[in-house]
Interface confidence: medium
């Protein structure tokens, strides 16, 4: 049984009756194939469900799909397959849902082999109605909405053409041929790579990076010898082949590719890769793969320009390009990230940073847990978190770690307690302070989700047997109650709740199996009557984030400021509500050397917080250069950590040194950049 499932727990009274009145079953009139679910808009209650069923015949595969729509968060569904003329929808393209609350949906249909182009069904009224449109091309990718204007769509064709629509897919225009990768930037800008000779694969490393800011009327070549590119926050990254060998190097632009600087990162060879782990408008976490098939690399964190990088974490687990990494942004507390390292003995250990990659430590051992067999010392060990890598290795881990920005401080994850990740069956752990302290929440693996901004946590046991019980907690996982939502157990396939954790509805998906047939079924439970009143001021308490030492005046200071939050008391059983806004009070901290990183040409000796000038850069180090605008080439040795808001206190001043002599770059010069028009 779960910790806290005892008589002393604070019980919610009469919850069985309250939940029974708010449990809605829907049996789908299909054979069991695959099912996909999408939420349309925010707080609209509209859900689209696409079920598909394949019958492999001797000559071809016959497919059938059905489309259902709910407008009450999944309590009732209506079959709307006739709105798409009973057409078979291609599941690999999914349902392309428009940004924000645009109400737009695009479904891509399966068409017969000889047709001139593909077919889509478009809705701009939250899937109440659909319009069929035949395309002048066969799509290779899902339609991509411009983040700024949901009427603007782009798609790549199977012939590598870049197609754009300005009227939500009604009319399409091919704006460029020979395109490998295309992405929307800001302000309706499109970035894409093109090949000149054979193909995307053959020209890898010889691609050109282009930009159009007017949906294809005019173009600008902003990079050559490109291997690939990526966008993160306000940064545009390109990996560029070196002139003299097969290595490549990251270049970065903060002005949409007009000017570039070489990132102070190691170059990589053909078998290695770069990966943007996380990026925002302040900085970027970059993984650089180690040479050889090691399965690990190094995490670097950038300055505010994306140019100067500090080594953040060695031996960072990342299996292969596009492979698995456990790197997780803990969205419930600023500055917190969790990931895994591959230690010298090939065991995998979890590390956490509370200051955006400045320092990494092991996770504190939960007080209510014993060290497992992986621990050398039974009294000293750490919590290790299962994430993407464990899931890819088919360990008994049904879900990755979970955190939500509006459920402040809460992190839920599968884990084991020892010296390294264990392959034994994991338990579920919870932190209520953003990862500083942990408690075992549930015994064994579970599916879990957060509702009502943390007011309710729901969990279902991960089992190969049919299930009919759901667990819920109203006190951040301390005490659990169980509710039998159906007499007839179902084979469970997934928990679904509206993204954003503001909803009070949870849908349990699964299928029933009888001797003759197998059918999809969903149960939607509304917890509104459990949380029967709205939260008031007295239900909240003040919490200082990142607090480790109350005696220290700088307690809670991370990246130059501290934040006090109003948090729901664990014993308060009430609704935060859909409109709940996290209340926080920031206060600025005094600057210390910890608030600065070392600028280009400077480094921190181990166990020293001062930045000292590197000896004259020689050989390989010459490639760690700044390129572009003149001001990049002057430094006072320190640079404020991106996002750091400290004021006063230590203000390191250095004589400005001209580092021009230390700088070379081989990337495209601005004067070589040419504009073209259609």
């Amino acid at each position: 049984s779960a910790p806290g499932e005892d008589e002393e727990c604070g019980r919610v009274r009469d919850f069985v009756a309250k939940l029974a009145n708010n449990t809605h079953q829907h049996v789908f009139d299909d054979l069991r194939g695959s099912v996909s679910l999408s939420w349309v808009g925010d707080s609209t209650g509209v859900i689209l469900v696409l079920t598909t069923f394949h019958v492999p015949l001797v000559i071809m595969t016959f497919g059938q799909s059905k489309l259902y729509r709910s407008e009450d968060y999944g309590k009732n569904f209506k079959d709307i397959t006739d709105l798409i003329n009973n057409t078979f929808i291609r599941t690999e393209f999914g349902m392309a849902i428009g940004p924000e609350n645009s109400g737009k949906v695009v479904l891509t249909a399966e068409v017969s082999g000889g047709s001139r182009g593909g077919r889509i069904f478009r809705s701009s009224d939250f899937a109440k109605n659909f319009v069929q449109t035949d395309l002048p091309f066969h799509p290779l990718t899902q339609m991509m909405y411009s983040p700024q204007n949901s009427d603007y769509l782009l798609a790549l064709s199977t012939e590598n053409g870049l197609w754009v629509s300005k009227n939500f897919g009604g009319k399409w225009e091919e704006i460029h041929k020979a395109v490998c990768l295309a992405k929307w930037g800001s302000d309706n800008t499109i970035f894409f790579t093109t090949y000149a000779n054979g193909s995307c694969k053959a020209d890898l490393g010889a691609l050109e990076l282009w930009r159009t800011s007017d949906l294809g009327k005019s173009f600008k070549t902003i990079g050559v010898k490109i291997y690939s590119f990526g966008l993160g926050g306000r940064f545009l990254f390109a990996s560029v082949m070196a002139d003299k060998d097969t290595t490549r190097r990251i270049h970065v632009s903060t002005d949409q590719g007009d000017t570039w600087s070489m990132a102070q990162l190691p170059s990589v060879g053909q078998e290695q890769f770069y990966s943007i782990l996380a990026a925002n408008d302040d900085m970027v976490f970059m993984h650089v793969d180690e040479p050889g098939d090691t399965g690990f690399g190094t995490i670097f964190t950038s300055d505010d320009r994306g140019i100067v990088y500090s080594k953040s974490l060695d031996r960072h687990l990342y299996t292969t390009t596009g492979g698995e990494t456990d790197f997780t942004n803990v969205t419930s507390l600023r500055g917190v990230y969790i990931t895994s390292v591959l230690s010298e003995d090939n065991s995998i250990q979890t590390m956490i940073t509370f200051d955006q990659g400045g320092r990494w430590t092991h996770l504190r051992k939960p007080e209510n847990s014993e060290c497992d067999a992986t621990a050398k010392n039974k009294n000293e060990c750490s919590l290790h978190i299962h994430a993407s890598y464990s899931i890819s290795q088919k360990l008994n881990v049904p879900m990755a770690p979970l955190s939500e920005p509006n459920a402040v401080g809460i992190v839920i994850a599968h884990g084991s307690v020892g010296d390294a990740i264990s392959v034994m069956v994991p338990d579920v752990y919870i932190s209520d302070d953003g990862g500083y302290s942990w408690t075992k929440m549930l015994e064994g693996p579970h599916y879990y989700t957060i509702l009502d901004s943390g007011g309710i946590i729901v969990a279902i046991e991960h089992s190969s047997r049919p299930i009919n019980v759901i667990k819920f907690s109203t006190d951040e996982g301390q005490c659990w109650q169980t509710y039998t939502f159906t007499r007839d157990p179902i084979y469970f396939t997934g928990l679904a709740s509206e993204p954003g954790a503001r909803s009070m509805n949870i849908s349990i998906w699964g299928f029933t199996e009888s001797a003759l047939t197998s059918q999809w079924v969903s149960y939607t439970i509304d917890f509104k009557d459990i949380l029967e009143r709205n939260c008031e001021e007295k239900d909240y308490t003040i919490w200082l984030a990142h607090s480790t030492d109350p005696e220290d005046y700088e307690d809670g200071c991370i990246l130059g400021y501290k934040e006090q939050f109003l948090r729901l008391r664990k014993s308060s059983v009430c609704q935060n509500g859909r409109d709940y806004v996290v209340t926080k009070q920031p206060s600025i901290c005094l600057c210390s050397l910890e608030d600065f990183l070392c600028d280009f040409g400077y480094y921190r000796p181990e166990n020293d917080s001062k930045c000292v000038e590197q000896p004259e850069l020689k050989g390989h180090d010459l490639e760690f250069c700044l390129y572009g605008r003149e001001e990049h080439l002057t430094t006072n040795g320190y640079r404020k950590i991106p996002g750091d808001k400290c004021q006063g206190g230590v203000n390191p001043v250095r004589e400005v040194k001209d580092l021009k002599k230390k700088c070379t770059s081989n990337f495209l010069s601005p004067e070589k950049q040419n504009s073209k028009s259609n």
């Epitope: 919490w543 005046y553 014993s571």
Partner: antibody, heavy 124, light 107 residues
Framework: QVQLVQSGAEVKKPGASVKVSCKAS????????MHWVRQAPGQGLEWMGW????????RYAQKFQGRVTMTRDTSISTAYMELSRLRSDDTAVYYC?????????????????WGQGTTVTVSS | DIQMTQSPSSLSASVGDRVTITCRAS??????LNWYQQKPGKAPKLLIY???SLQSGVPSRFSGSGSGTDFTLTISSLQPEDFATYYC?????????FGGGTKVEIK
């Protein structure tokens, strides 16, 4: 060492006001809530409210709402509790007490340091 | 407001006795329950916080347990300096409330 030193005993007439001070030393004053608790002769303990010295935010027990004002002066690490419209049943020992903190939570962990108490007598 | 009910209101015991005081909350307060000791003419002293955590400097003969609504303070072997009044206090929901107290006297 950590201590709270309160002002001396007061004798007041009904309808008057009293202001009790509590000077903190030996710790970072703004990092801990300050609670005020009173105890009538021969009775139990009664919580009046708290002040967050960092922000000046307060929370008062409903019973004292409108009559109590809690303030602080961070420059001299002192908290104040003023009770107005005094009645005879306000005769009590008034304590200031520091709220214990744990991993960021300001409430929920009791009061770990107490002042020596200030006796307030309300009599006509 | 949450009512805190302490029992017994007084008890007589001898040095070396094991003493148990209970405290019941009118609704769940999770583990936000604290215990204090008060001697005549003195300010209260925090013994146990968060239901079971021993405040530093407090002898280990004092222990606390419970969560939700029912809590217990135990003195494993009563010492002469332990004769005092003991109060429980919930600090989970405003207003903070105290129990009525339990007076431990010498038998």
């Amino acid at each position: 060492q950590v201590q709270l030193v309160q002002s001396g005993a007061e004798v007041k007439k009904p309808g008057a006001s009293v202001k009790v001070s509590c000077k903190a030393s030996g710790y970072t004053f703004v990092a801990y809530y300050m609670h005020w608790v009173r105890q009538a002769p021969g009775q139990g303990l009664e919580w009046m409210g708290w002040i967050n010295p960092n922000s000046g935010a307060t929370r008062y027990a409903q019973k004292f709402q409108g009559r109590v004002t809690m303030t602080r002066d961070t420059s001299i690490s002192t908290a104040y509790m003023e009770l107005s419209r005094l009645r005879s049943d306000d005769t009590a020992v008034y304590y200031c007490a520091r709220g214990k903190r744990s991993s960021g939570w300001y409430e929920g962990y009791g009061m770990d340091v107490w002042g020596q108490g200030t006796t307030v007598t309300v009599s006509s | 407001d949450i009512q805190m009910t302490q029992s017994p209101s007084s008890l007589s015991a001898s040095v070396g006795d094991r003493v148990t005081i209970t405290c019941r909350a009118s609704q769940s307060i999770s583990s936000y329950l604290n215990w204090y000791q008060q001697k005549p003419g003195k300010a209260p002293k925090l013994l146990i916080y968060a239901a079971s955590s021993l405040q530093s400097g407090v002898p280990s003969r004092f222990s606390g347990s419970g969560s939700g609504t029912d809590f217990t303070l135990t003195i494993s072997s009563l010492q002469p300096e332990d004769f005092a009044t003991y109060y429980c206090q919930q600090s989970d929901v405003s207003p903070i409330t105290f129990g009525g107290g339990t007076k431990v006297e010498i038998k």
